[in-house]
Amino acid sequence: DYKDDDESRTETQPPVTNLSVSVENLCTVIWTWNPPEGASSNCSLWYFSHFGDKQDKKIAPETRRSIEVPLNERICLQVGSQCSTNESEKPSILVEKCISPPEGDPESAVTELQCIWHNLSYMKCSWLPGRNTSPDTNYTLYYWHRSLEKIHQCENIFREGQYFGCSFDLTKVKDSSFEQHSVQIMVKDNAGKIKPSFNIVPLTSRVKPDPPHIKNLSFHNDDLYVQWENPQNFISRCLFYEVEVNNSQTETHNVFYVQEAKCENPEFERNVENTSCFMVPGVLPDTLNTVRIRVKTNKLCYEDDKLWSNWSQEMSIGKKRNST
């Protein structure tokens, strides 16, 4: 397909040839093309490309372009050739190549397909059945990410209420660039009756830490010392804690944000690997105090900033006063 700009053209290069498109993995779409035939000999060829909605304009010397995109809708790339990197230079007639999602009734595709990376150790995806699907549909989830050689099938399909889901191991690799990538997801049915659904989950989003584990509560004067075990797998700059203290007598509900803190006071079990400590000031020792803690990722490490861990198990200290 050829796309010509409406504006009158100065001398331009011929269009690129043999523009083709293919899909690698689950959601990596790759366009390749050949240089134009009969290009000027004094021209150092560059290729101008953008997607159908004029997004992501790029001028580069390579004869290929790829994008990671969930193939839930048609996507088109337009490519032209030119003799410089100047964006104001008019490229050749633009050639367009589109790729459509797999066929099927859109109403049959699963909806609300989303995934959460639990404690940087496993990913749990869930979805709702499409409107036009039979209740006995058997779903299959496929996934792929950079550290896998091939596409994998998720084995642990489950059902929770209206939602279906599947979880698979995904452990953070020491390679520092691991989290700069994404997991590609596809859900379809075994019988091939429903339209496949795709999702791309950036590894810098949707991270939910495990809850902390409270190890010890103790009083020193009017201060309450709290010691807990941090969730594994995270570095200290990427987490913070919310400590909630409820007092039965005053019915106060105090919330403290806490940076991972070393256990340096003599009241704490010291130098225990992967534990944090915090001192809650001004707590009445002769009343019942109940503590629970949850943890959240830091926005500078993980972009999705709305996922707290579940609350830890509560732990109490002090005496509940008899009501007279």
Epitope: I235, S236, R237, C238, L239, F240, V255, Y257, Q259, E260, A261, K262, K296, N298, K299, L300, D305, K306
Partner: antibody, heavy 118, light 104 residues
Amino acid sequence: EVQLVQSGAEVKKPGESLKISCKGSGYSFTSYWIGWVRQMPGKGLEWMGVIYPGDSYTRYSPSFQGQVTISADKSISTAYLQWSSLKASDTAMYYCARMPNWGSLDHWGQGTLVTVSS
Amino acid sequence: EIVLTQSPGTLSLSPGERATLSCRASQSISSSYLAWYQQKPGQAPRLLIYGASSRATGIPDRFSGSGSGTDFTLTISRLEPEDFAVYYCQQYETFGQGTKVEIK
């Protein structure tokens, strides 16, 4: 007591380089981020970037990426902000501040006034 | 990139009055990351509120923060003479443009 003490005011010419400092004390310097904030004369606050001295991980605001370099020397609990080639538009007050993981700036330095003029 | 818009630009009030300052985010943000600062002329800013509603150490209880999603509010229940200053909201890389609270 948590304290951040910044280096003194600087007067420079366009094209010159500069490195200003921020020394932390009274807390575990490697356990908190240090952020840098610019305030041009009569204007509001602008977040430039942060460093985590524990592992020297840095993040820059897109507007300041490539314009400045943030570094830290944890052995002397000091963070730095530097320019390789100053411009007149870099004239401003620069603040360092301690930042816990939830992103608020809870303790501030007194500020370093940088004046760039030919 | 998230934009924080503060309103009004200037608030003219008398000591003893209640001040209500607004900070609106261009998209929904986690309240954990929303902070408020006070800055007086010739001084460094001072943290008042973090996590949208938690008062920083040493901040009087006439200062309170509230809100979630895209709309956040800083309230000063009874203005004292020392409260006349510029107030900024912030979420990580982004500051609002500031609200000046001046004496009427």
